[in-house]
């Protein structure tokens, strides 16, 4: 019965069994709900918008790493719908702290203004880097069907034309 179905399962009335919700492919995220016994008739998979990615399954699309704005690093590989961005060496005027454990964001570059003397990335650097934060553009992506729904992320979302 419905109550026995798991987080990513719906009750199949034909077979009388819990069935796995269809997983989405890389670069997609679930649209509408499926799980704990129920599946919306219009449940499906929608593409990640340009600035987000997903590995598929039941994962929602996540924003790409902001190499330049947050990490103060160069972009080694720009992200796409299926992959996160990969960051490269620090931007000019920034350096990587040696022998420092990675935090939840990985390696973050720090301003040469705060660097110890003779830090190799900062030798010859002028007055450091200006705080040039790129503007963050929010996604205006809507949903395929124009009605209120609850996504798997748990966020209600009303799409309007």
């Amino acid at each position: 019965e419905y109550s026995n179905c798991g987080e990513n399962e719906y009750y199949n009335q034909t077979t009388g069994l819990c069935q796995e919700c269809p997983p989405c492919g890389p670069g997609e995220e679930p649209y509408l709900s499926c799980g704990y016994g129920t599946k919306d008739e219009d449940y499906g998979c929608v593409p990640c918008p340009a600035e987000k990615f997903s590995k598929g399954g039941y994962q929602i699309c996540r924003r790409h790493k902001d190499c330049e704005g947050f990490f103060r690093a160069t972009v080694l590989t720009p992200g796409d719908m299926e992959n996160d961005a990969e960051c490269g060496p620090c931007l000019p005027g920034y350096y990587m702290l040696e022998n420092r454990p990675r935090n939840i964001y990985g390696m973050v570059c720090y301003s040469c203004l705060l660097a110890p003397p003779n830090t190799k990335e900062c030798v010859g650097a002028t007055s450091g880097a200006s705080a040039n934060f790129p503007g963050t553009s929010g996604s205006s992506t809507l949903s395929p069907f124009q009605h209120a729904h609850k996504e798997l992320s748990g966020q209600g979302h009303l799409a309007t034309a």
């Epitope: 269809p22 008739e41 593409p47 949903s143 069907f145």
Partner: antibody, heavy 119, light 107 residues
Framework: EVPLEESGGGLVKPGGSRKLSCAAS????????MHWVRQAPEKGLEWIAY????????YYSDTVKGRFTISRDNAKNTLFLQMTSLRSEDTAMYYC????????????WGQGTSVTVSS | DIQMTQTTSSLSASLGDRVTISCRAS??????LNWYQQKPDGTVKLLIY???RIHSGVPSRFSGSGSGTDYSLTISNLEQEDIATYFC?????????FGGGTKLEIK
């Protein structure tokens, strides 16, 4: 075997009614949402109606809302479009199209049936 | 409603050419962009879905790209069988809307 085959087109007088059918074969019809899309002579494609796999969700374009009704009979693998209060601007080729199982596009199309509204 | 604009209504090219057809949405459609081919006999087929994914059975000479409001379909090596009208379509929000179409002809 053609997966989707429309029928029911023909000449109708303005204000008249017509019911189009779309017979599905070769796939599990009851698993798929279905659409009607039309194309007026020498014009582009226009989506007009959608019905989900079990008929819970139905949507229409503003141009046909209140005049057209989409329905389906999963036992008979058939999609319908009941058209009433027909106008000359409803003259078009009417296609039924299948929604891909999980994704939001038309992955299989019928050959179309022609409806002419004229006195 | 979201308006889909294909500025080029007809396009003439030679066999073997690389052809690009453009499509613009009136607002961000977040990669919910599909391309269809309509042959002169009226037959409609899906080519590309979700901006860049090739539908099964579609030749690899077809490709799609774009993001936000601007999208394109490219045929890398035009063949005789590609003579058709090409429509873009947004599936981002109802009502689903199509571009006006681009008719591809042989020079």
């Amino acid at each position: 075997e053609v997966p989707l085959e429309e029928s029911g087109g023909g000449l109708v007088k303005p204000g008249g009614s017509r019911k189009l059918s779309c017979a599905a074969s070769g796939f599990t019809f009851s698993d798929h949402g279905m659409h009607w899309v039309r194309q007026a002579p020498e014009k582009g494609l226009e989506w007009i109606a959608y019905i989900s796999s079990g008929s819970s969700n139905v949507y229409y374009s503003d141009t046909v809302k209140g005049r057209f009704t989409i329905s389906r009979d999963n036992a008979k693998n058939t999609l319908f479009l009941q058209m009433t209060s027909l106008r000359s601007e409803d003259t078009a080729m009417y296609y039924c199209a299948r929604r891909e199982l999980l994704r939001f596009y038309f992955d299989v199309w019928g050959q179309g049936t022609s409806v002419t509204v004229s006195s | 409603d979201i308006q889909m604009t294909q500025t080029t209504s007809s396009l003439s090219a030679s066999l073997g050419d690389r052809v690009t057809i453009s499509c613009r949405a009136s607002q961000d459609i977040g990669n919910h962009l599909n391309w269809y081919q309509q042959k002169p006999d009226g037959t409609v087929k899906l080519l590309i879905y979700y901006t860049s994914r090739i539908h099964s059975g579609v030749p690899s000479r077809f490709s799609g790209s774009g993001s936000g409001t601007d999208y394109s379909l490219t045929i890398s090596n035009l063949e005789q069988e590609d003579i058709a009208t090409y429509f873009c379509q947004q599936g981002n929000t109802l009502p689903w809307t199509f571009g006006g179409g681009t008719k591809l002809e042989i020079k």
